[in-house]
Structures are given as C-alpha cells and as structure tokens.
Interface confidence: low
C-alpha cells in the first residue's frame, strides 16, 4: 500500500541502490518514487552532518522485505517511495530553496528581476533541469539578478551549497508548464542520430517514449522494432540528447521508429506507467515470485500490488496452468525494463501499474509507525 | 480572496469552480476534488439552488475568463448535504457532490488528501486559502484563481472574536489579528489546505466570517477532520470501496 509518513531523526541502514544531492526530503522522495528499484530513502539536511560531501545527501534504498533497520541520526529524514500512491505520484516539484546554490553545468546566464522569472526561463529552455538565482542582495554586485540555467548527467545537482542570497529550484516541465510545446509525432522508419544517454528494452515505441519523457536527459529517442535486421538490437529503445535539443540528423531506416520526449508538452504529460498488455510476448527478468491467478488482468493487479514487481509474464502453457488458474511470473530488473523480450510465446506480458496516478488506492494513507 | 496573489497552473489542482447556468452563467462557489467522482464543498452554496442540472463544475482551470461554451465541465449526479446543517448557526456547513462521470487525474486536476479522522494533534503552520471570490468586501469575482497564506487561529481565540456565535470544535478559524488577508464572497466551499511533511491536506472548507479580512475577525471554516466518518459513509460505494482519497 501507500505509505506517506516521514521518519524524523532516522536513517535507514543498508540497501543503497543510488545516491544523489537533493535540496530537501520531498525531492529525495520523488526521486525514490521514480527510481525503478527504490522503496525507501534517507536524506541528510545540511544541519544534520558535518561531512560536507554528505550534506544534502539523498540515499535511495531497496529491500527484499520492503523495510530496513532504522538507526537514530539527528536531523536525518527517512521515508518510503510513493510508488502505489496514485495521484501523489508526480515529478512536478515547485519549491524554491532560499539560501541554497544547486551546482551543475551552467549553460546559460541572464539577468532577470525575480526568482520566479528565472524558474520560468528554466521551464522554457529545453535543456534546463534546475537553476540558481542571485538575489538583489547577493554579496558580489556583478552577479546580482543573475539567473543560471543548469543541467547535470543525472538531472540532480552535482553538489548543493549553503549560500546566502541565492535561491534555487527545478524546471517546472514535469508540471506540464513548459511554453516550449512538444512533438507528438512518431516517425516510422526513421532513426535519429546524436548522443545515447541510455538503452532499455521496450515492447513498443510508446513505452520507449514514456521512458524518454521521464528520463532526466532524454530529449528524443529511436526504437528498433522486433523485426529489426540485427537480432541483438530488436526492441532496443535508445534514449538520446544533443547540444541543440533536437536531432542533428535523421536517417531513413526500415523497422525503426523515432520521436521526442513529451516533457515539454503544455497542459498534459503521459502517465509514468504503461498499462497495455502484450499478448504472445515474454518479458525476461529477475524472478520475484510466481503465483497462480485467473487471467492476465489479475496477474497485472498482483504485480501492481507487490511493490517491488516491475513487470510480469502470464503463461498459458498447459504445464503452467491448473484448472482456470495459470502461472503469473512477477519480475524485476535493475532499470525497470525487461532484460529480454521474446515473441511467439503462449502467454502475455505487461508492466506494473504502481506508478499510474489514476489509481483509486488509498493514496493519502499514513500508517502510524509503532515504537 | 482578500490580500492574495495570482496562482499558477496546477498549483492547486483540486480546486474547482461551482457555477450556475440559468439565463447567464456565473461562478458561485469553490470546491475541492477529493476523488475521481467526488467534490467537497459548503452546504450553503446550495441555499435556494437545489437543482442539480443548473450546476456546472469546472476543474483543472486557472482563469475563469478562459471558460467558453466549449470548455468541458462536470455535471452533478447527486448533492449530499449534511443532515444537520442550519444556516442560522453556521454549523455542519459541508456538502458532497457526486459527479455524473469520473474525472481523470492530471497535473492540473487531481484530488486533495483528507485529514485523519478527528485530527487534533497535527500542528499546521503552512496553510493557504484559494478561490475566485471577491478581493474586497464590496468587490467582484476574480478571473485568476487567487491564493493567500493565512495562519490558523485557536478556537478559543476565534470564539473571543465572535461573541454572538458559537465556534464549535467542528469549525477551524484562520486569519491575521490585523486582518488584510482572508477568504471572501465567492470563495465559499473552497479549500483551506495545509502542507505538512510535504503533503497537502484539506483542513477546512471556506464557510463564513464577519465581512472579509477585517481586523480581529478571522475566517471560519468547516473542520474536515471532524466530518471524516460522514464523508466516508456518504462516499462509500456499493462495493464497499471508498471513492475518494481517504486517510487510514
């Protein structure tokens, strides 16, 4: 179920799957929510630790049991991912942090009159992920009212420093507030060039596009279909970026599909989940559990309810069925995508709906933690 | 909202505008989306206008002037008004609206979490009231959704300010001693939300007050935590599943 409580002065021991710098616990929780394996997180505010390297540290954690031992750490904040939390699942983060400088690659500097204007510029720039703004009272006069647009390899700051009269925040593109607009077109038999930022396996171009949309550095993608001539590249989804923000070239290529991230869409973003079920397809991955259920929809529901499950395969092989129930293979991987996609199987596959934000699950639940 | 500022897109995605279409169409009250098919508002919004089919509910909007005849709206399937509501006392000023069709959630249209039943221990320090209501006592409906940060006031303090009325434990008050910031006419039924541990919760429903933003006259809101049993009972569907965002 959905757990929203935060644990003050507590730090989860072990289970680390990733770490990064975030300005507060809420942003850390959001990164955990969107990380394919993160179930728990711990955050160290500046006041909680003397080690400058670990200040603003956000530690994403996984656990086979869904929980980890808590140790007392003054000032630390820990909590749960919001996977399974329905409408609370959002990559939108509006807060502006005063007295904080979020470091990254500064690729654009301009003078603006307010931090809101700076945030708006970041939101309307295709490459900007976060920003810092030097206020009117910044100690160095030449930097006053400077708006620095930034990005980083992981989409989060490379460092966060306490600095007076500086205000920082994130792009509001995930809030569907970008003025850029987006390209909804899917280009059949066309491959984009430029830099690959990630490679995942997906059953179709639409899943590829959604993954691109929620990847911090993906601006466009190319998907190689299941009939692509090179077998090892079939169902490969290449997430891409470029200096200009658009592909520098595109090559006509049979059995490829290309398109753009939808992060810059105005007013509507795709849900960060994939609800389609793929008949005759087997998704490979690490086995989490195998259970007998009646029907592929129940298999998907079972996967959705098991928080660590990322995708599933429902087998219809005679040896995998007894009476009306067949085997439901609940699976996971390091990146949340299948490690292999096989066709012509007797069964169906699909993804967990744990990140869908339309669920009617009790998304505001706060379970009281026992002492 | 008196003393407020313009909101931005998706800042308050649970805020809805309750409008009536007779000869003309106009905004009358606010409301809060609490589930795919449920809106929570004030009972007094329906005083004299009990007809379900004259109401139009606009969600996912920021600027009332953007509404055209083509703007999608929700219609009411059922109005459920608290059985003990009495205008003369201002008590139990709470109503549920069941929409004819469920709404999809987006960044601009999603529900607000409700408080835990009888929530008295949480100290809320970051509370906001939103609405398209008057910006002064003798004002007019605003086009852009307004927001204002207002501190909660203890019921004891509130009772001192309203000697002629009974401020019950099922009400919550908010305002500044010096006035200047408050809800006003047209904000009724809308949300008083507070952010706690990074999560917004619906603490109050805009109900009443003496004038708007007057010195030492806080706004009075229906305390949602006190009505959780009623909300859950009324929103419970036939399959026994609550159709709104309820706490455990």
């Amino acid at each position: 179920g959905c757990l929203t409580q935060l644990y003050e002065n507590a730090f989860f021991r072990g289970g680390d799957v990733a770490s990064m710098y975030t300005p507060n616990a809420q942003y850390c929780q959001m990164r955990c929510t969107f990380h394919p394996r993160c179930l728990l997180f711990s955050f160290l505010p500046a006041s909680s630790i003397n080690d400058m390297e670990k200040r603003f540290g956000c530690f994403l954690k996984d656990s086979v049991t869904g929980t980890l031992p808590k140790v007392h750490r003054t000032g630390a904040v820990s909590g749960h991912s919001l996977k399974q939390c329905g409408h609370q699942i959002s990559a939108c983060h509006r807060d502006i942090y005063k007295g904080v400088d979020m470091r990254g690659v500064n690729f654009n500097v301009s003078k603006v009159s307010s931090v809101e204007e700076c945030q708006k510029r970041c939101t309307s720039n295709i490459r900007c992920q976060f920003f810092s703004y030097a206020t009117q009272t910044f100690h160095k006069a030449e930097y006053r009212n400077n708006c620095l647009l930034k990005y980083s390899p992981g989409g989060t700051p490379t460092a966060i420093k306490v600095l007076s009269n500086v205000e920082s925040g994130f792009s509001l593109k995930p809030c569907a507030l970008s003025e850029i607009g987006c390209h909804m077109n899917i280009f059949q038999h066309l491959a984009f060039s430029d830099v690959d930022v990630a490679r995942v396996l997906t059953p179709d171009a639409f899943v590829c596009r959604t993954i691109c949309t929620y990847h911090p550095n993906c601006l466009f993608f190319t998907f190689y279909t299941n009939v692509w001539k090179i077998e090892s590249q079939r169902n490969v989804c290449l997430l891409k970026t470029s200096e200009s923000g658009t592909p520098s070239s595109s090559t006509p290529q049979e059995n490829t599909i290309s398109g753009y991230s939808l992060l810059t869409c105005k007013r509507t973003l795709p849900e960060p989940c994939h609800s389609k079920i793929y008949p005759g397809v087997d998704f490979g991955g690490e086995e989490l559990n195998v259970t007998f259920v009646k029907g592929v929809n129940v298999c998907q529901e079972t996967c959705t309810k098991m928080i660590r499950c990322q995708f599933f395969t429902y087998s219809l092989l005679p040896e995998d069925c007894k009476e009306e129930k067949c085997k439901c293979f609940l699976r996971l991987s390091m990146d949340g995508s299948p490690t292999r996609i096989a066709y012509g199987t007797q069964g169906s596959s699909g993804y967990s709906l744990r990140l869908c934000n339309t669920g009617d699950n009790s998304v505001c639940t706060t379970k009281t933690s026992t002492r | 909202i008196v003393g407020g500022t313009n909101s931005s897109w998706g800042e308050w995605p649970w805020q809805v505008s309750l409008q009536v279409k007779l000869t003309a169409q106009r905004h009358l009250c606010g409301g809060s989306l609490i589930g795919h098919q449920w809106v929570l508002t004030a009972a007094h919004c329906f005083d004299g206008l009990p007809l379900q089919d004259v109401w139009r509910i606009y969600s996912g909007i920021l600027n009332l002037s953007d509404i055209t005849k083509d703007t999608p709206f929700s219609q009411i399937k059922e109005i459920i008004i608290h059985q003990n509501y009495k205008v003369s006392e201002g008590n139990h000023d709470i109503a549920l609206i069941k929409l004819q069709a469920p709404l999809n959630y987006t960044e601009f249209q999603k529900p607000i979490c409700l408080p835990s039943k009888g929530d008295t221990s949480t100290i809320y320090t970051n509370c906001w009231v939103t609405g398209w209501g008057f910006s002064k006592e003798k004002g007019e409906i605003q086009n852009i959704l307004q927001k204002v940060n207002i501190p909660l006031v203890t019921n004891e303090e509130c009772q001192k300010r309203y000697q002629d009325y009974k401020i019950t434990q099922r009400m919550v008050c908010a305002g500044y001693k010096e006035g200047g910031k408050d809800a006003c006419k047209g904000d009724s039924g809308g949300p008083l939300v507070c952010k706690h541990n990074g999560m917004w919760r619906l603490v109050g429903i805009t109900s009443w007050g003496e004038g708007c933003a007057r010195r030492e006259q806080p706004g009075v809101y229906t305390k949602v935590a006190e009505y959780m049993d009623w909300i859950l009972e009324k929103t419970q569907s036939s399959d026994g599943k609550a159709q709104m965002q309820s706490p455990a």
Partner: antibody, heavy 122, light 106 residues
Framework: EVQLLESGGGLVQPGGSLRLSCAAS????????MMWVRQAPGKGLEWVSG????????VYADSVKGRFTISRDNSKNTLYLQMNSLRAEDTAVYYC???????????????WGQGTMVTVSS | DIQMTQSPSTLSASVGDRVTITCRAS??????LAWYQQKPGKAPKLLIY???TLESGVPSRFSGSGSGTEFTLTISSLQPDDFATYYC????????FGQGTKVEIK
C-alpha cells in the same frame, strides 16, 4: 425586528406595466435568496420568481417568464418585480418572502411581507 | 413541472378533533416539503419543513409525515386558533404550492 414591506401595487390596464418593491430590514438582506409569491383573490398561493443573493441568478414560473423581471439592490436592501404585458390573470396579492434559516434546501419561506394588491382590469 | 395535489379541499371539524390533510406530488420530491397556515387577509405562516420538522414556535399538536410522493399534515387536537387554510409546498425542483385545504368549523 425582521420586516418585509411591499409597495407599488395598484390598478393597471391589461398590457400595462407595474413595478413592485419590497423593502427589507432587520437582517443582512444581501445574504439571502428572495422570492415573490402571489395569491389571486379566493385562490391558492403561486410562486412567481426568485433571485439568488448576488442578484446574478434569477428564476421564474412558466406563467410569468418573459414578462416579469426580478431584481434586487443589495445596497438599498430592496427587492423589485418589474411586471410588463400584464394580464387579467395576474390580478393577485403579491408577497415578497425569503428563507431566513435552516438546513440547506430549506427553500420554504419563513418570512413574508404583508402583501401588495395588483389589479389588472380595463 | 411538479404538481401538488391537496385533499380534501375543505374540511369541517370541531375543536378537539384530530385532523389530517394529505398532499400528493406528481413525482418524488424526497422530503422537500413544507406546510403553511394562512388566515384571511394575512401572509402565510410556516409550520413544518422537510416534511416532518416543526418550525420553532409552532405548537407540537402539528406534525408532518411522509416522503417521496405522499405527505400528511396532522393536527392532533384542533384548537380554535387552527381554523385556517393550509398549503403544502414542494421545493425539490423550484417551488410549487398545493391548491390549499380550508379547515372550517363544523
């Protein structure tokens, strides 16, 4: 003391016009929905028209739609009924009324004026 | 439009009698019904609202019941002051009155 005082009634020829007023005192007039109800001599009560507190919403009985206009001036605590194209069947005592208190949808009228007589005759 | 039909039109009774007046709606109005008393030359006076709730200050000998389409006003023991005309009114959809029931001295 709560009071409603109607005025403006009188004798008028068919096709003529008349404007009724209702002066309110003793309560916050602008907060309430106000009504006109009429009663033909020796007959029952008939709801005529209603106006929401802000004045933007008006509703009419079918029998008067298009001929009568209800309005209010909250600054003067006054309710009006402009009656045009009057007919003999509009002859009645016209009461203004409002719902002062109660549970929602308490659209029964618990405060009434004393009424003003309108006679439409040639 | 919702029609309200009252019966009887006239009712002759004596002081101390139990009197019942019925009101029928042309479609369901839930409990959104009020009863009024009117004396000659006077404005109507509210007795009961929401089908069965007694307005404050109204004697307890008056009671109302019913829901949906069938409603009843009962005067348990008729008093001299109760000889008047009684009206029902629905407020489920706009407002409609019944044609009235005159309670006269037998």
């Amino acid at each position: 003391e709560v009071q409603l005082l109607e005025s403006g009634g009188g004798l008028v020829q068919p096709g003529g016009s008349l404007r009724l007023s209702c002066a309110a005192s003793g309560f916050t007039f602008s907060h309430y929905i106000m009504m006109w109800v009429r009663q033909a001599p020796g007959k029952g009560l008939e709801w005529v028209s209603g106006i929401y507190s802000s004045g933007g919403i008006t509703v009419y009985a079918d029998s008067v739609k298009g001929r009568f206009t209800i309005s209010r001036d909250n600054s003067k605590n006054t309710l009006y009924l402009q009656m045009n194209s009057l007919r003999a069947e509009d002859t009645a005592v016209y009461y203004c009324a409002y719902r002062r208190t109660g549970v929602p949808r308490r659209d029964e009228f618990d405060i009434w004026g004393q009424g003003t007589m309108v006679t439409v005759s040639s | 439009d919702i029609q309200m039909t009252q019966s009887p039109s006239t009712l002759s009774a004596s002081v101390g009698d139990r009197v019942t007046i019925t009101c029928r709606a042309s479609q369901s109005i839930s409990s959104w019904l009020a009863w009024y008393q009117q004396k000659p030359g006077k404005a109507p006076k509210l007795l009961i609202y929401k089908a069965s709730t007694l307005e404050s200050g109204v004697p307890s000998r008056f009671s109302g019941s019913g829901s949906g389409t069938e409603f009843t006003l009962t005067i348990s023991s008729l008093q001299p002051d109760d000889f008047a005309t009684y009206y029902c009114q629905q407020y489920n959809t706009y407002w409609t009155f019944g044609q009235g029931t005159k309670v006269e001295i037998k």
